[in-house]
Interface confidence: medium
């Protein structure tokens, strides 16, 4: 599923991401935009043999199990395929664990490079939330 901007903002808010660990909803929508272009089925492979999955491009070396990443920790205790569902519950729950891990949203390279320090509220402007 490819979400609309406001559709995703509403879904993320429903799942409790607004101001989760101090990160406003705009941060999460911005991260999803530049990680996956709002596509729940996005997959991207990394040079270390791991793969990033879903709307928030969660990595198989640390957070989920795709059955083929050497040394996978699976800290979210889920199959990576669950992160590709049109229902973003699994991605959100795992993202909450990631953002609580110590580095905050710096764990997402796209957020660090494209969202951090910008007017992230622009990503939810005009949305009926």
């Amino acid at each position: 599923k490819v979400f609309g901007r406001c559709e995703l903002a509403a879904a993320m808010k429903r799942h409790g991401l607004d101001n989760y660990r101090g990160y406003s909803l705009g941060n999460w929508v911005c991260a999803a935009k530049f990680e996956s272009n709002f596509n729940t089925q996005a997959t991207n492979r990394n040079t270390d043999g791991s793969t990033d999955y879903g709307i928030l491009q969660i990595n198989s070396r640390w957070w989920c199990n795709d059955g083929r990443t050497p040394g996978s920790r699976n800290l979210c205790n889920i199959p990576c395929s669950a992160l590709l569902s049109s229902d973003i519950t699994a991605s959100v729950n795992c993202a909450k664990k990631i953002v609580s891990d110590g580095n905050g949203m710096n764990a997402w390279v796209a957020w660090r490079n494209r969202c951090k320090g910008t007017d992230v509220q622009a990503w939810i402007r005009g949305c009926r939330l």
Epitope: Q41, T43, G67, S81
Partner: antibody, heavy 116, light 107 residues
Amino acid sequence: QVQLQESGAEVMKPGASVKISCKATGYTFTTYWIEWVKQRPGHGLEWIGEILPGSGSTYYNEKFKGKATFTADTSSNTAYMQLSSLTSEDSAVYYCARGDGFYYYWGQGTTLTVSS
Amino acid sequence: DIELTQSPATLSVTPGDSVSLSCRASQSISNNLHWYQQKPHESPRLLIKYASQRASGIPSRFSGSGSGTDFTLSINSVETEDFGMYFCQQSNSWPRTFGGGTKLEIK
């Protein structure tokens, strides 16, 4: 137990297309990548690409882009590979395998012969 | 693409001999190297995963070693059922690639 059952041998004319199937049993089909491998005598094993059935996400070896197309039907736990514009170079045994980085589980292979 | 070069192409041995098969990668692949055995008209069979881990059900006479670019599959006291083709495969990057194979034949 995990099993991958491929469709039977095919004899096709040059220029035609063929669709090979791989039915998976004994595990959660949507969770694992299905990979496709080509074997020709004297050419060893070649990785064609992969599909994650749960999402339909696909990756292709550049060499096989435009030649192979992967699909999956999660209702029947079956992955498919279509090969188009067949030539004699496509005559080979084609295997599906479960993608665990390594390949512990393989199909029995589908022999494709392209001949006029 | 990562190229895997296997040597020798053919190895003629007598049952009871011990042998080593080599697989060399064109760039470092850490331990992401796997070994397969294939008999005529059969699918490949996984022997060793991640350079040195024996797959389920594989006899202890098979062992693997190496890291980086140079890898070895060793068979201690070859048995008649061990004859066939042996392939290595890397999973360090895409596309996945295989070596050209080593044929283990009876002398």
